[in-house]
Amino acid sequence: GSSPGPDAIPRGCPSHCHCELDGRMLLRVDCSDLGLSELPSNLSVFTSYLDLSMNNISQLPASLLHRLCFLEELRLAGNALTHIPKGAFTGLHSLKVLMLQNNQLRQVPEEALQNLRSLQSLRLDANHISYVPPSCFSGLHSLRHLWLDDNALTDVPVQAFRSLSALQAMTLALNKIHHIADYAFGNLSSLVVLHLHNNRIHSLGKKCFDGLHSLETLDLNYNNLDEFPTAIKTLSNLKELGFHSNNIRSIPERAFVGNPSLITIHFYDNPIQFVGVSAFQHLPELRTLTLNGASHITEFPHLTGTATLESLTLTGAKISSLPQAVCDQLPNLQVLDLSYNLLEDLPSLSGCQKLQKIDLRHNEIYEIKGSTFQQLFNLRSLNLAWNKIAIIHPNAFSTLPSLIKLDLSSNLLSSFPVTGLHGLTHLKLTGNRALQSLIPSANFPELKIIEMPSAYQCCAFGGCENVYKISNQWNKDDGNSVDDLHKKDAGLFQVQDERDLEDFLLDFEEDLKALHSVQCSPSPGPFKPCEHLFGSWLIR
């Protein structure tokens, strides 16, 4: 053995293995990654843990382990096992964890696993299993966790699962399952987590999930579903549902009516065109709802009873109006993204007191009333670009003390109210051709970035000094997560991921040079100095 000192080597430690005593004077034996082709023969009866993973073991003789009545965990992962005979695990009365992943099993052993009464966790993933014998799991009354992912199953082994009434988590992901039959999991009333992602599932029996009364997490991501999985309606405890990356084209009315506990629904990367207006009603735990490009949606969804929603993204649809009482339904909303719709008029959003980010770019909005954004004390970012806004009420932005980013680019503005905007760090007004007046820089003591319709308007902001990567800075804080919006922003924005690091450092260096001067574009530049621009302005 290779334990600390020569005197400390416990008796019954196979050569080259690493052994130590656990707190109960039982032996933990690590024989992993030693190039073994067979099981060590002189194992102590008092072994509680045996790791034989990452070796070259191709056979498990029926009698070698039967004396290890204290063995609780047996690791045989990453070997060359193609078959496990009946009796291989006989006598392992204390066995709780059995790891057989990354071997070459073509079927679950027919009898070797039966009646391991203490077994709680069984890993059979990453083999070549295409067949699960009907009675292979019989007698596994304590089994809680079963891994069968990354195998070659074409069907759910319905009969084999009938004896696993204590099972709490199971993964059948990364197989070749094409259909789930009615009552496929009918006896798994304790199952909490079921992973079916990365299969070839194209159809679900209407009652395929019946019996899963404890299920909280269901993952159907990366399959070939053409229709919404209506079979979820009996899953009254479901909290997390994933069916992203399928081929689902519509979400029906009252789609989640049987799932009032849903907290998270992932359904992106589906060609969803239509969503029933009542689909997301009465989901009191739902925090985030994101739907992009559902071009057949014309009406804002009914969200009665979904009052804890914090982030709502409904982009690329044909929504032309919002309900007047939208904020009565959504008092906890922090992020509202309705970009790329057909909104013309906006109701008052003042009831959405927690709003931090609003994105309404690419709509048909023509006017911002005084009441629209009143008293949104937490609002930090407001994007109204690419609309038809010609009129903004003088006090439209007067009660937005946290606002630091305002984008009004590509509208029809001829004037711009500055009341209440003294905290802005970013302002975009480019593309408003009728906006010709100079905006006094004194109104924006915190401003870092500004984009104006014309170069001469930058002169008020010391515009000749810097050329700057403005668009990069503008978007730096636009992470969609609500948590990102909580982070305090001192003009230098959070690095979202490692790819941004280089840009961030360059910008940081530029900031240090510029100190607190405003970066304004389009910059007058050396060939159009401010003096020249002011001259032509005065002549004009």
Epitope: D210, T230, G258
Partner: antibody
Framework: QVQLQQSGTELMKPGASVKISCKAT????????IEWIKQRPGHGLEWIGE????????DYNEKFKVKATFSSDTSSNTVYIQLNSLTYEDSAVYYC???????????WGQGTTLKVSS | NIVLTQSPASLAVSLGQRATISCRAS??????????MHWYQQKPGQPPKLLIY???NLESGVPARFSGSGSRTDFTLTIDPVEADDAATYYC?????????FGSGTKVEIK
């Protein structure tokens, strides 16, 4: 414990409609299908159809599609069957039952007797 | 529709003896290894009571003298030994396919 309580005996005239109720207690109402079964002396048991309470999911035996309509009210945990254009052949005992283990009917209401006579 | 034919129509059994009831389906009711056949007991003036589900699984609370067997199209309900309380009509039912159907019933009398 699980119980299904049905409404009482109904005496109706031909051509009329009747609505029979089935109130469920003791389990998560919306998680199990409710089945409706008709029993006439000498005709055995006939499956009318099923409803998943609270949802729009229903299934009808083709034979009863015109005759029966199911509905549910989750606020009172009650399922209903409406039978219309009543004839003498509709006289029977109507049972609601819960679709339990693998769709077997594990709990039954006590039955509602419908008598159609002029 | 799947037709379930029960036999015999009636059966008289002595106390302590074995009663065997047969149910034959017009087509297989097996799916992925499960046989979607169930057995019920009905006494006069009462609703049916579930005894056996999926051909051979005893419903909780049902005495072990009841047992079920069979697959595909041929199924059997056995009561062994019969007790006085077992006098009733017994029905098989399939839910493999809509519309779900019942057998015509077997009336068991105790001699």
């Amino acid at each position: 414990q699980v119980q299904l309580q049905q409404s009482g005996t109904e005496l109706m005239k031909p051509g009329a409609s009747v609505k029979i109720s089935c109130k469920a207690t003791g389990y998560t109402f919306s998680a199990y299908w409710i089945e409706w079964i008709k029993q006439r002396p000498g005709h055995g048991l006939e499956w009318i159809g099923e409803i998943l309470p609270g949802s729009d999911s229903t299934d009808y035996n083709e034979k009863f599609k015109v005759k029966a309509t199911f509905s549910s009210d989750t606020s009172s945990n009650t399922v209903y069957i409406q039978l219309n254009s009543l004839t003498y052949e509709d006289s029977a005992v109507y049972y609601c039952a819960r679709g339990g283990h693998y769709g077997s009917l594990d709990y039954w209401g006590q039955g509602t007797t419908l008598k159609v006579s002029s | 529709n799947i037709v379930l034919t029960q036999s015999p129509a009636s059966l008289a059994v002595s106390l302590g003896q074995r009663a065997t009831i047969s149910c034959r389906a017009s087509e297989s009711v097996d799916n992925y290894g499960n046989s979607f056949m169930h057995w019920y007991q009905q006494k006069p003036g009462q609703p049916p009571k579930l005894l056996i589900y999926l051909a051979s699984n005893l419903e909780s609370g049902v005495p072990a003298r009841f047992s079920g067997s069979g697959s595909r199209t041929d199924f059997t309900l056995t009561i062994d030994p019969v007790e006085a309380d077992d006098a009733a009509t017994y029905y098989c039912q399939q839910n493999y396919e809509d519309p779900f159907t019942f057998g015509s019933g077997t009336k068991v009398e105790i001699k």
